[in-house]
């Protein structure tokens, strides 16, 4: 004969454990039901009655089967430099990620604590490593035969055009200027195209290294040449 199915609450076998989606209540000394995601324990079980669950209130959640007396509070609204990629529901917390053109400089368990604007490489420098959601752009000086004349978080060093007759030689920050005959493009070293960064469609200009606090900075940063712009904390 099959073993009799025990209904919660029930006393476990000596040395035994409770089943999936059950927990052992120390006070009642019984195996009791957990509450499903989106709910919490309104009334704990006794020897004769099972756990009473209730739905989470607005702006609170539980993500796992649980027996917590209160649901967890959802995180505060996403800051201006972030976008909400997961809304606050009864079953999940809000997740904020950095908006395009920014990256997460300091992460937290879910989402981002501090967003910062992706570095823009100045003329003479090109992108050596594109930015990602969690890492900044890495710039490098343009090697001989290549140039970058932009301030950009995506542009790489490009090869100088090859002229039949050079009017002005190119350098790291300027392309060669040819006389009227049509130029061709060289395949200079270091001119290989990099994949586009994950998130760099920024409408926000990288603050120039000027002697003032960077705009869009919600930290109390010192006055002085302060290149990176940081967003507010996303807690």
């Amino acid at each position: 004969l099959p073993a009799q199915v025990a209904f919660t609450p029930y006393a476990p076998e000596p040395g035994g454990t409770c089943r999936l989606r059950e927990y052992y209540d120390q006070t009642a000394q019984m195996c009791c039901s957990k509450c499903p995601p989106g709910q919490h324990a309104k009334v704990f079980c006794t020897k004769t009655s099972d756990t009473v669950c209730d739905s989470c209130e607005d702006s609170t959640y539980t993500q796992l089967w649980n027996w917590v007396p209160e649901c967890l509070s959802c995180g505060s609204r996403c800051s201006s430099d972030q976008v909400e990629t997961q809304a606050c529901t009864r079953e999940q917390n809000r997740i904020c990620t950095c908006r395009p053109g920014w990256y997460c400089a300091l992460s937290k368990q879910e989402g981002c604590r501090l967003c910062a604007q992706l570095r823009k490489c100045r003329p003479g420098f090109g992108v050596a490593r594109p930015g990602t959601e969690t890492s900044d752009v890495v710039c490098k000086p343009c090697a001989p035969g290549t140039f970058s004349n932009t301030t950009s978080s995506t542009d790489i060093c490009r090869p100088h055009q090859i002229c039949h007759v050079v009017a002005i030689p190119g350098n790291a920050s300027m392309d060669a200027v040819c006389t009227s005959t049509s130029p061709t493009r060289s395949m200079a070293p270091g001119a290989v195209h990099l994949p586009q960064p994950v998130s760099t469609r920024s409408q926000h200009t990288q603050p120039t290294p000027a002697p003032s606090t960077a705009p869009g900075t919600s930290f109390l940063l010192p006055v002085g040449p302060s290149p990176p712009a940081e967003g507010s904390t996303g807690d």
Partner: antibody, heavy 121, light 107 residues
Framework: EVQLVESGGGLVQPGGSLRLSCAAS????????LSWVRQAPGKGLEWVAY????????YYSDTVKGRFTISRDNAKNTLYLQMNSLRAEDTAVYYC??????????????WGQGTLVTVSS | DIQMTQSPSSLSASVGDRVTITCRTS??????LPWYQQKPGKSPKLLVY???KLAEGVPSRFSGSGSGTDYTLTISSLQPEDFATYYC?????????FGQGTKVEIK
């Protein structure tokens, strides 16, 4: 107020090791690139090592490459310099500096007070 | 490596004098050049960056000029607090070398 406070300097024998630390405050540490610069007694300044804000990119001067390692802990707002196989010529005041924001803002804008490393038998 | 030639290595001047320090690089560094001031027993301080831009809080008697391989730091009217050692530095390809320094002394 930006503050960079070095520690860990001292007297060490040739061939020995030392780990310098730099505790930073007053700015969003994880968004800034950092470097170590040293100055031998009565001499000029020498750049030693650089690390970018995420710790992905590191550069070293030829004189320390393979012996020194720069690292950072963004959760602790701390920069490190692990110095191995020390030589007499490594004797210097070591400065923790903020910058350069390489490729974008190329300068050292804040300097620590320095910590003295003496390599002698 | 890019060589930095700073001159003079030292100079004697009086309060009110105009002082010029030069820095020459072995190849173009595209104005990626800061100047620092260091007083005895103190840490260096940023004066000028990008060859010509004055750092925050630096008096306007300091100015930077130059491009390509030739750069100049000028103090238009030397003040008592300006007696110090001055360093140029490049931020082009690594290693990022400093000039040898110019010690400005009281005449």
């Amino acid at each position: 107020e930006v503050q960079l406070v070095e520690s860990g300097g001292g007297l060490v024998q040739p061939g020995g090791s030392l780990r310098l630390s730099c505790a930073a405050s007053g700015f969003a540490f994880s968004t800034y690139d950092l470097s170590w610069v040293r100055q031998a007694p009565g001499k000029g300044l020498e750049w030693v090592a650089y690390i970018n804000n995420g710790g992905i990119s590191t550069y070293y001067s030829d004189t320390v490459k393979g012996r020194f390692t720069i690292s950072r802990d963004n959760a602790k707002n701390t920069l490190y310099l692990q110095m191995n196989s020390l030589r007499a010529e490594d004797t210097a005041v070591y400065y923790c500096v903020r910058g350069p924001f390489y490729g974008s803002a190329n300068y050292f804008d804040y300097w620590g007070q320095g910590t003295l490393v003496t390599v002698s038998s | 490596d890019i060589q930095m030639t700073q001159s003079p290595s030292s100079l004697s001047a009086s309060v009110g004098d105009r002082v010029t320090i030069t820095c020459r690089t072995s190849e173009s560094i595209y104005s990626n050049l800061p100047w620092y001031q260091q007083k005895p027993g103190k840490s260096p301080k940023l004066l000028v960056y990008d060859a010509t831009k004055l750092a925050e809080g630096v008096p306007s008697r300091f100015s930077g000029s130059g491009s390509g391989t030739d750069y100049t730091l000028t103090i238009s009217s030397l003040q008592p607090e300006d007696f110090a050692t001055y360093y140029c530095q490049h931020f082009w390809v690594t290693p990022w070398t400093f000039g040898q320094g110019t010690k400005v002394e009281i005449k």
